[in-house]
């Protein structure tokens, strides 16, 4: 079986995550994303920091980034809406909504994911699924096919220890364990899914991967329900 994907996960079942998006810059994978409405993909604001002069598109219905697949379609972006409070030097408010040039053609391999609206922390220890096309090992290899890993949610107090993230994890963020299994470079903007519901978005702040003392940080979508609704309206 495939080993060591994302970091420490494995290849995802093809098209089993129909909400999964690849945010692309000039035709290459840049970040993950998640389809939250027919014409909207949620990702991370920092993903577009270096994209000023490039063409941003969204790939939906994909398992392989390179191989032809009937469900794959690349959409242009009509509008990019970063959270107004996102800043280059912080991990706070690291959300981005991308409006596709047209409504996505929905089907078994392309479908929006329900997102959490109840602003309550996910219970520590809950196993959540994170998927992406980010690097898969310590060499920095990027995969062609979608990878995923199950990660237990870590309580905020532990995540905020001085030895961990030293108080940086606000109530609008959540953490997941990172001991060998972790999200990593290129997974930013992708979904953290708990019980079939989108709970978090992988932050794109720079962070060492696979180190248990540096847990993965995820933006809690429930904390931004009002902003998401206002943009999608």
């Amino acid at each position: 079986p495939p080993r060591g994907r994302i970091l420490g996960g494995r290849e995802a079942e093809a098209h089993a995550r129909p909400y999964m998006a690849s945010v692309q810059l000039n035709g290459a994978h840049l970040c993950g994303g998640v389809l939250v409405a027919e014409q909207w993909v949620l990702s991370a604001a920092h993903c577009l920091e270096d994209a000023a002069d490039g063409k941003v598109q969204v790939l939906l219905g994909a398992h392989s980034l390179s191989q032809p697949e009937p469900s794959k379609r690349l959409y242009d972006v009509l509008r990019a809406v970063p959270h107004p409070d996102s800043q280059p030097d912080t991990i706070d408010h690291d959300l981005l909504l991308l409006q596709l040039s047209e409504k996505a053609t929905l089907g078994p391999a392309v479908r929006p994911l329900p997102w959490q609206r109840v602003d309550r922390d996910v219970a520590p220890g809950t196993l959540c699924d994170v998927a992406g096309w980010g690097i898969v090992n310590h060499a920095g290899r990027r995969p062609d096919s979608l990878q995923h890993v199950l990660l237990p949610v870590l309580d905020r107090a532990t995540c905020n220890r001085r030895t961990h993230h030293d108080g940086a994890i606000t109530e609008r963020l959540m953490c997941a364990e990172s001991n060998r299994r972790d999200s990593c470079k290129g997974d930013s903007g992708g979904p953290l899914v708990c019980g079939g519901v989108l709970e978090g978005v992988v932050t794109s702040g720079s962070r060492v991967c696979g180190n248990r003392k540096k847990p993965g940080i995820y933006t809690r979508v429930a904390s931004y329900a009002a902003w998401i609704d206002s943009v999608l309206a």
Partner: antibody, heavy 113, light 106 residues
């Protein structure tokens, strides 16, 4: 097309320092890890370490700590290897590699008085 | 620190012959990479994640193994395969190379 272009050969005196460069084209070094590898004459390969250019985090083999410093400049898409307090043991070809799948042509460093 | 031991250190094979070389780890690893290096040239990635062929590598090359025992096989030796082959593990820091196997053409 992905390419890694390394700086030219260096001839240096014992005790001196040298900085080697590796400039990438065809991809953004922030998207992966950049590695440096040493190969002494007629010897095998030695992994020196790597850098994540997006954040500057490095991981070096302990035997090169204090000897090698890896840095990167994302604005010029270039990774660097600085070697200090050079001795004859540092005479080698030094390679850069991105994610270990694309390699530079190597830079020869000769330490001699 | 994990030590990778390659064997044999030197071997020779005739064109068309099947070639196998091994890489033994001092403790269990998950990922194994294999590289080919010809004299005067940079190393070239052949195999990643134990058994996956890197881009442009002929299908006569294959990799296998698990735990502490890994191998690289060439199904039919060709003259251009004469080179030194190195293994490297990507599971546990630091990430050393093996000592190398020099493959010569008979």
């Amino acid at each position: 097309e992905v390419q890694l272009q390394q700086s030219g050969a260096e001839f240096v005196k014992p005790g001196a320092s040298v900085r080697l460069s590796c400039t990438a084209s065809g991809f953004n070094i922030k998207d992966t890890y950049m590695h440096w590898v040493k190969q002494r004459p007629e010897q095998g390969l030695e992994w020196i370490g790597r850098i994540d250019p997006a954040n500057g985090y490095t991981k070096d083999d302990p035997k090169f700590q204090g000897k090698a410093t890896i840095t990167a400049d994302t604005s010029s898409n270039t990774a660097y290897l600085q070697l200090s307090s050079l001795t004859s043991e540092d005479t080698a070809v030094y390679y850069c590699a991105s994610a270990m799948d694309y390699w530079g042509q190597g830079t020869s460093v000769t330490v001699s008085s | 620190q994990i030590v990778l031991t390659q064997s044999p250190a030197v071997m020779s094979a005739s064109p068309g012959e099947k070639v196998a070389m091994t890489c033994s780890a001092s403790s269990s690893v998950t990922y194994m990479y294999w590289y080919q290096q010809k004299p005067g040239s940079s190393p070239r990635l052949l195999i990643y994640d134990t058994s996956n062929l890197a881009s442009g590598v002929p299908v006569r090359f294959s990799g296998s193994g698990s735990g502490t025992s890994y191998s690289l096989t060439i199904s039919r030796m060709e003259a251009e395969d004469a080179a030194t082959y190195y293994c490297q593990q990507w599971s546990t820091y630091p990430f050393p190379f093996g000592s190398g196997t020099k493959l010569e053409i008979k």
